[in-house]
């Protein structure tokens, strides 16, 4: 009789579908992730099962707390889709599918500088390229650790370019660029390139 009651409850809002989620949706290969399967009903003893496509990954019992499944994303197929099943006695409901986005981290970008020197100004062109990493990549240029450009999005493997004009400065300036894609909290920086101060003939990046 209890199973019948539970199945009847499933047809109402007392036992809705479980929710499958992860704090991390964008991952890189080799990353460990936790998947949470939770249910609004906090009073029932629920058996949670996790599936990826058509393979069974594990089963946990829980009451009031979400089931936590820890996985390592090492292969492309492990992006998903995943689904979670909540079962009470002989009745069960499934979550919506959940998939991770696997992103290759960006490698340290290379910054190239080209300068056209006039009597009064320096016309500087900065090029920044990260040769590895999932697209799109956002590039930001820095001068003396201060951002001087907006994020420049590149959807192809071409360098980001930023132009600026400076009055001939009296002191050295350091430039670098940052490359970042959809991986959260994962940005890489180029080696700094120092522009020497004006004076004499020292302009190694200048076009003569």
């Amino acid at each position: 009789r209890k199973a019948v009651l539970d199945c009847e409850a499933m047809k109402t809002n007392e036992f809705p579908s479980p929710c499958l989620d992860s704090k991390t949706k964008v991952v890189m290969k080799g990353q460990n992730v936790s998947m949470f399967c939770s249910h609004k009903n906090k009073s029932l003893q629920i058996t949670y099962s996790l599936f990826r496509r058509k393979t069974h990954l594990g089963t946990q019992d829980g009451k009031g707390e979400p089931a936590i499944f820890n996985l390592s994303i090492t292969e492309a197929h492990e992006s998903g889709p995943y689904k979670c099943k909540a079962q009470v006695t002989s009745c069960s409901k499934y979550s919506r599918d959940f998939s991770f986005t696997i992103v290759d981290p960006v490698t340290s970008p290379v910054l190239n500088i080209m300068v056209i020197q006039t009597e009064t100004d320096r016309h500087i062109t900065l090029h920044c390229l990260s040769v590895n990493g999932s697209l799109p990549i956002n590039y930001t240029f820095f001068e003396n650790h201060v951002a001087i450009s907006p994020a420049i999005s590149k959807y192809d493997r071409e360098p980001a370019e930023f132009n600026l004009t400076k009055k001939n400065p009296g002191e050295e300036e350091e430039y670098r660029c940052e490359a970042k894609n959809r991986l959260p909290n994962y940005a890489t920086y180029s080696h700094p390139v120092t522009m020497p101060s004006t004076g004499g003939d020292s302009c190694p990046f200048c076009l003569k």
Epitope: R53, K54, T55, H56, G58, H77, S92
Partner: antibody
Framework: EVQLVESGGGLVQPGGSLRLSCAAS????????ITWVRQAPGKGLEWIGT???????YYSTWAKGRFTISRDNSKNTVYLQMNSLRAEDTAVYYC?????????????WGQGTLVTVSS | DIQMTQSPSSLSASVGDRVTITCQSS????????LSWYQQKPGKAPKLLIY???RLASGVPSRFSGSGSGTDFTLTISSLQPEDFATYYC????????????FGQGTKVEIK
């Protein structure tokens, strides 16, 4: 070349034990599922059990307790340990590989090994 | 236990005939489509024909097709060829009482 090779079959007395091996080549058992299937002479296919890429094992109701599936990743080999064998366990035993993340879409099969339980 | 009932258990047909084999499960398969079909010839290992109930496995001729969902499935050979005389099995995957698989008892397709 992707292939599975079963070994370890033969004649065994009722009540005896036997361990079958399924050697995989051309792919890794840490990605694919291996399933054991048997076929008694003149009969149909029967699912015995499965070990998935995570090492989780699943068994048919009748096999639970008597049959155990394990694997050795370093040897890329899956084993079927069969205990308390009976005459009705006489069959050709196959191991088969599933698609990635699809345990029972069995697209690669071994040639089978014959187990005969008789006194 | 889950029962997979295949019908007919055997049939006689001629080259060029349209052949239909059905598989009925006592419970819904996982995802409503966790079902595959296999062909087996005497002394040989089975060969995967159809997966996901209706998707053709690699290298399988297009005269083979599958359909169905939940508990009722069909394998159709649109125009039987000499090499198609064999025994056919369905295999369902389930998660209702653990993670479980079950074969149908087989259908032998013979020459009329």
């Amino acid at each position: 070349e992707v292939q599975l090779v079963e070994s370890g079959g033969g004649l065994v007395q009722p009540g005896g034990s036997l361990r079958l091996s399924c050697a995989a080549s051309g792919f890794s058992l840490t990605i694919y599922t291996i399933t054991w299937v048997r076929q008694a002479p003149g009969k149909g296919l029967e699912w015995i059990g499965t070990i998935n890429s995570y090492g989780n094992t699943y068994y048919s109701t009748w096999a639970k307790g008597r049959f155990t599936i394990s694997r050795d990743n370093s040897k890329n080999t899956v084993y079927l340990q069969m205990n308390s064998l009976r005459a009705e366990d006489t069959a050709v035993y196959y191991c088969a590989r599933g698609y990635v993340d699809s345990d029972w879409y069995l697209n690669i099969w071994g040639q089978g090994t014959l187990v005969t339980v008789s006194s | 236990d889950i029962q997979m009932t295949q019908s007919p258990s055997s049939l006689s047909a001629s080259v060029g005939d349209r052949v239909t084999i059905t598989c009925q499960s006592s419970e819904s398969v996982y995802d409503n489509n966790y079902l595959s079909w296999y062909q087996q010839k005497p002394g040989k290992a089975p060969k995967l024909l159809i997966y996901d109930a209706s998707r053709l496995a690699s290298g399988v001729p297009s005269r083979f097709s599958g359909s169905g969902s939940g508990t009722d499935f069909t394998l159709t050979i649109s125009s039987l060829q000499p090499e198609d005389f064999a025994t056919y099995y369905c295999l369902g995957g389930y998660d209702s009482s653990g993670w479980y698989a079950a074969f149908g008892q087989g259908t032998k397709v013979e020459i009329k």
